[in-house]
Amino acid sequence: SQPQAVPPYASENQTCRDQEKEYYEPQHRICCSRCPPGTYVSAKCSRIRDTVCATCAENSYNEHWNYLTICQLCRPCDPVMGLEEIAPCTSKRKTQCRCQPGMFCAAWALECTHCELLSDCPPGTEAELKDEVGKGNNHCVPCKAGHFQNTSSPSARCQPHTRCENQGLVEAAPGTAQSDTTCKNPLEPLPPEMSGTMLM
């Protein structure tokens, strides 16, 4: 036979040496070059010529080494679905979208297709931090010891309790998961009706 180093070359077992950059063309029983990202097949290969590639037109792309005869149409991020653009479409990459702030991905099909509002975390809790923002709905976890969070919010974080002594004050009432420590001037007694506030 006639061993060849570059496509097109004969393939007896229907596999090609470089699976990423070559493909098996069954009519001619050969391995041919794929087109690089940002291009498409303008003329198919044969035993006598390799694949001919052309650049994707404006507003279209192909992300991978391919043997597609067309480029994919760029699509905008749909704000109605709660998406926003983080990077524009190029010939080599589709528009990069993410969920708008305060939203999470509720429908996933290779990429996020629909975002919904994050659930509120009640007082005394905060949203567990995730590796990737917008990937899932909030999972509320209790504030750890010495911290509080006093609102219903999808994004508020638990804050450390105020340390009265750092301000030259004394503790009038201890902090809870839902409220801060109450401090008072060490010289003044705390009136009974003024709990939960800091007196100067």
Epitope: S1, A10, E12, H28, R29, R47, I48
Partner: antibody, heavy 120, light 107 residues
Framework: EVQLVESGGGLVKPGGSLRLSCAAS????????MYWFRQAPGKGLEWVAT????????YYPDSVKGRFTISRDNAKNSLYLQMSSLRAEDTAVYYC?????????????WGQGTTVTVSS | DIQMTQSPSSLSASVGDRVTITCKAG??????LSWYQQKPWKAPKILIY???RLADGVPSRFSGSGSGTDYTLTISSLQPEDFATYYC?????????FGGGTKLEIK
Amino acid sequence: EVQLVESGGGLVKPGGSLRLSCAASGFTFSDYYMYWFRQAPGKGLEWVATISDGGSYTYYPDSVKGRFTISRDNAKNSLYLQMSSLRAEDTAVYYCVREENGNFYYFDYWGQGTTVTVSS
Amino acid sequence: DIQMTQSPSSLSASVGDRVTITCKAGQDIKSYLSWYQQKPWKAPKILIYYATRLADGVPSRFSGSGSGTDYTLTISSLQPEDFATYYCLQHGESPWTFGGGTKLEIK
């Protein structure tokens, strides 16, 4: 000994249909791409259809695309050509042909042919 | 489609003669050319493949040469059984196309 024996030819009216068969023997049929070629009376040879070894891929020239269908049954060592919407210009001897399965892609065995006549 | 131009279309020769038939492709077919012999009422038979290689069982008086677009079939010393029609076929690019044939007749 490799043998390819065609059958199913005959006289058919324009617009009619016919199914050709080819019985293969003497080799592992499922290892080979198979073809149909034809030869009109007093004319040269013409490629008609191709089918891959497993039958997944089929190919046709524009002259028969949409009218002819090649198929195979590897369990029965048989090749078929279903012809429909036949025209006078489809009148020819039809040959069942094996393509060698190495790297040179030539046609090493041909059947004796079956005659198809399209006439009113 | 790749056009295959075969010449001559017919040829008269005598037993013992050296005969040459040529095929010209419309573009470089990278030696993906084979030659077939056909006798009346018979199927074609392979003679030469990949432009120059002799098929199994074919007498050595048959030979093929050429590359690119120009190819030749030579019969070095004609025998009585060689009087037939000869076809070239390109199978480098689909659709596969044949030359028009050369009818070799006894002079």
